[in-house]
């Protein structure tokens, strides 16, 4: 009945509603139907959120923070529905709401506890800083404070640096991990316990490939089944690192099934893509193609990074000419 938020029943006429920042929610309240309905929603027993009586809204003394953000289900009041539709919730809206309903038969009071969560999609980045390599798991806006865990080759790592910036609304969090010289696979999990939402970033380093000039190279990129759900929208990006920064070679959007290729020697196999295999070919290699190639498969729930190191060596012909 109430699709915009989920709520948990707890004792004493009190329910917990969990909403997401900037989304609409419903604070539920029901009563035994009767005539002469009076409905008063209040926040923290002090601030007037919404009043309805004598068949219409009375918002003259509504607290300004709720202006144009609240409404009732007017066609359902006579059926005992006093629920409040609440637009664009913010973290400042968290707290206890009391719904007073009076009718010709009875008066009831319901309490609803509103909790608001934020979870902007995190990202996993691979960065080179001088001679060091770092994996960084970051989330731009999250509330409450998330749980971040790292694993190396599926074994939890205790070392977990967290750089946190708090704003009025939420936290911004970076968790960097130094992976210099490592060939292990790494996994970072960020969990928002309130919203029951988990995001996972996984990084895998493939064996280095040695190729001759003018040859072509095939670089594999297949999602791990544990994370990958083909029904979910995702994006695949292939990029190459040159002098510390990545330049995008190509990307694919699952929603539109669009492929954009920025490098003419790059090719993707359409049939393989349909089988969720995003391996790529790079033709006619030259010496400047040496470097790190990164495949990034990302959705709202995961980021899968696969890194290949390619060494392009001069062909025999080129060497003998020199």
């Amino acid at each position: 009945i109430f699709p915009l938020a989920f709520f948990i029943y707890v004792p004493m006429n009190e329910q917990i509603v969990i909403g997401r920042l900037d989304e609409d929610i419903i604070l539920p309240s029901s009563f035994e139907r009767g005539s002469e309905v009076v409905i008063h929603w209040k926040y923290q027993d002090s601030y007037k959120v919404h009043s309805y009586y004598k068949g219409s809204d009375h918002l003259e003394s509504q607290d300004p923070r709720y202006a144009n953000r609240t409404s009732l289900f007017y066609n359902e009041i006579q059926n005992g529905n006093a629920s409040l539709f609440f637009r664009r919730v913010s973290l400042l809206d968290e707290g206890i709401y009391t719904c007073y309903v009076g009718t010709a038969i009875q008066v009831i009071t319901n309490k609803v506890v509103l909790k608001v969560g934020v979870f902007l999609t995190p990202v996993m980045k691979y960065e080179k800083r001088n001679t060091n390599s770092f994996l960084i798991c970051s989330v731009l806006s999250v509330y409450p404070r998330p749980i971040i865990t790292w694993k190396m080759d599926n074994t939890p790592i205790s070392e977990n640096n967290m750089e946190e910036t708090g704003s009025l609304d939420s936290f911004s969090i970076n968790s960097p991990l130094n992976i210099t010289g490592s060939n292990s696979s790494y996994e970072c999990t960020i969990e928002n316990s309130l919203l029951k939402q988990t995001w996972t970033g996984r990084w895998t380093m493939k064996d280095g490939l040695h190729k001759m000039q003018s040859e072509h190279v095939s670089l594999s990129c297949q999602p791990v089944n544990d994370y990958f759900s083909p029904n979910q929208d995702f994006k695949v990006t292939w990029s190459r690192m040159k002098s510390g920064t990545f330049s995008v070679l190509a990307y694919y959007l699952s929603s539109s099934q669009n492929t954009i290729i920025n490098e003419s020697r790059f090719s993707w196999n359409k049939e393989l893509i349909n089988q969720s295999d995003f391996s790529m070919n790079l033709m006619d290699l030259n010496l400047s193609d040496s470097g790190e190639y990164l495949c990034n498969i990302s959705s709202d729930e995961y980021t899968l990074l696969t890194i290949h190191t390619v060494h392009v060596e001069p062909s025999q012909e080129t060497a003998s000419h020199n």
Epitope: S35, D45, Y53, K54, S61, Y100, G102, V107, T109
Partner: antibody, heavy 121, light 107 residues
Framework: QVQLVESGGGVVQPGRSLRLSCAAS????????IHWVRQAPGKGLEWVAV????????YYADSVRGRFTISRDNSKNTLSLQMNSLRVEDTAVYYC??????????????WGQGTLVTVSS | DIQMTQSPSTLSASVGDRVTITCRAS??????LAWYQQKPGKAPKLLIY???SLESGVPSRFSGSGSGTEFTLTISSLQPDDLATYYC?????????FGQGTKLEIK
């Protein structure tokens, strides 16, 4: 059963003050708005003031605004009407009456028996 | 303020009669009207709310009708116990106002 009992009436000189009380029982006091309604001897009924269930909203008739103050103590189930600068025309039986619900409806389901206030020099 | 005018001021009727009291508002009050009965020396008693809804415990010989500015209270068969003064009251808006009352006498 619902009971409202007024007290505090008496004879007072013009310009003086008086405080009326109303003791409520038989219902959850903090759920209901309570009104004061008065009736001058041999005359009709006149609404005086209302205080809503939680005490934050108070409304007054023009004839008493600025002179009378309505208040309540939900922990003691009592209602008060502080009457200042009394005038001869304030002479009446004062009734406390319970609203249908919060105080927002504005009609009177249960009444006390009233207390007489006489303003006379 | 909204003015409420009742008619007649006094009404004399016999037991068993059908009695009608009228109340007129100076402006539309939708159906936000109540009727009270006050017996001599007693507090008023709610009979009708929302123009036509009978309060719990009130005998069914009492009924109310009307909306906007014209309202009536009807006693279908007058009983000796109905000797009282009857008041209408608007609760559309503050200040709530009463009619001046209709005194009902039994012949």
């Amino acid at each position: 059963q619902v009971q409202l009992v007024e007290s505090g009436g008496g004879v007072v000189q013009p310009g003086r003050s008086l405080r009326l009380s109303c003791a409520a029982s038989g219902f959850t006091f903090s759920d209901y708005g309570i009104h004061w309604v008065r009736q001058a001897p041999g005359k009709g009924l006149e609404w005086v003031a209302v205080i809503w269930y939680e005490g934050s909203d108070k409304y007054y008739a023009d004839s008493v605004r600025g002179r009378f103050t309505i208040s309540r103590d939900n922990s003691k189930n009592t209602l008060s009407l502080q009457m200042n600068s009394l005038r001869v025309e304030d002479t009446a039986v004062y009734y406390c009456a319970r609203d249908r619900s919060s105080g927002a409806m504005g009609y009177f389901v249960y009444w006390g028996q009233g207390t007489l206030v006489t303003v006379s020099s | 303020d909204i003015q409420m005018t009742q008619s007649p001021s006094t009404l004399s009727a016999s037991v068993g009669d059908r009695v009608t009291i009228t109340c007129r508002a100076s402006q539309s009050i939708s159906s936000w009207l109540a009727w009270y009965q006050q017996k001599p020396g007693k507090a008023p008693k709610l009979l009708i709310y929302k123009a036509s809804s009978l309060e719990s415990g009130v005998p069914s010989r009492f009924s109310g009708s009307g909306s906007g500015t014209e309202f009536t209270l009807t006693i279908s068969s007058l009983q000796p116990d109905d000797l009282a003064t009857y008041y209408c009251q608007q609760y559309q808006s503050y200040s709530y106002t009463f009619g001046q009352g209709t005194k009902l006498e039994i012949k």
